[in-house]
């Protein structure tokens, strides 16, 4: 097992709607064609993975139909984009990205972005 | 809160073998630094072993080199000290420590550890 780099944004701020974006870019030391990016939540002394996905090389990044990620890849570049997010899931969101295939197996691990989530004001009621 | 938990120990001959075993409870141990420290009768209480978050960085007190073989297995949750080839001076109680640290520390072995289990005693004796 090799270890390579990877590069994240050091803070996100969610929208007001709950969705964070971030670019996940790792430095491959060689041609990879299956790549695994998995993302990770540490918070109060806790790791919990957030989701994860196996792609080809110029194909599509695609989750599970239940998964709250959603991205795209470009290159040695993920776009990572986060949703439903809520106040209570602010934290470092690490990206850890692994080039499965072909061998040798490689293992980067960012040092984390600080997603922050600010759950939006109800709107008062309106008088009209 | 996470807390740690050793078992594995008892007494054993010069030249047997015993795995010790740091399990969590109340939480996982993914990505943490674990720790083996051990204390003799007596004496300080040394770092035999510890093992990266990733599993990729393990470290071995000179004494222990060749004989010892700290491992994770992260779908049990617990890391595993394997002793071989124990000696009269291997006698003690073992302690499983832990620190999560940031990820840019996670291929590293912790300097400090904030958790310390309860520790299992060691007896190499004839």
């Known amino acids: 097992c090799k270890a390579m780099h990877v590069a994240q944004p050091a803070v996100v701020l969610a929208s007001s709607r709950g969705i964070a974006s971030f670019v996940c870019e790792y430095a491959s030391p060689g041609k990879a064609t299956e790549v695994r990016v998995t993302v990770l939540r540490q918070a109060d002394s806790q790791v919990t993975e957030v989701c994860a996905a196996t792609y080809m090389m110029g194909n599509e990044l695609t989750f599970l139909d239940d998964s709250i990620c959603t991205g795209t890849s470009s290159g040695n570049q993920v776009n990572l984009t986060i949703q439903g997010l809520r106040a209570m899931d602010t934290g470092l969101y690490i990206c850890k990205v692994e080039l499965m295939y072909p061998p040798p197996y490689y293992l980067g691990i960012g040092n984390g972005t600080q997603i922050y989530v600010i759950d939006p004001e109800p709107c008062p009621d309106s008088d009209f | 809160e996470v807390q740690l938990v050793e078992s594995g120990g008892g007494l054993v001959q010069p030249g047997g073998s015993l795995r010790l075993s740091c399990a969590a409870s109340?939480?996982?141990?993914?990505?943490?630094?674990i720790g083996w420290f051990r204390q003799a009768p007596g004496k300080e209480r040394e770092e035999v072993s510890c093992?990266?978050?990733?599993?990729?960085?393990?470290n071995y007190a000179d004494s222990v080199k060749g004989r010892f073989t700290i491992s994770r297995d992260n779908s049990k949750n617990t890391v595993i000290l394997q002793m071989n080839s124990l000696r009269a001076e291997d006698t003690g109680v073992y302690y499983c420590t832990g620190k999560l640290l940031h990820p840019s520390l996670w291929s590293a072995c912790a300097n400090e550890y904030d958790l310390w289990g309860q520790g299992t005693q060691v007896t190499v004796s004839s």
């Open positions: 093992i990266s978050g990733t599993g990729l960085r393990t």
């Open positions: 109340g939480g996982t141990l993914d990505y943490w630094s």
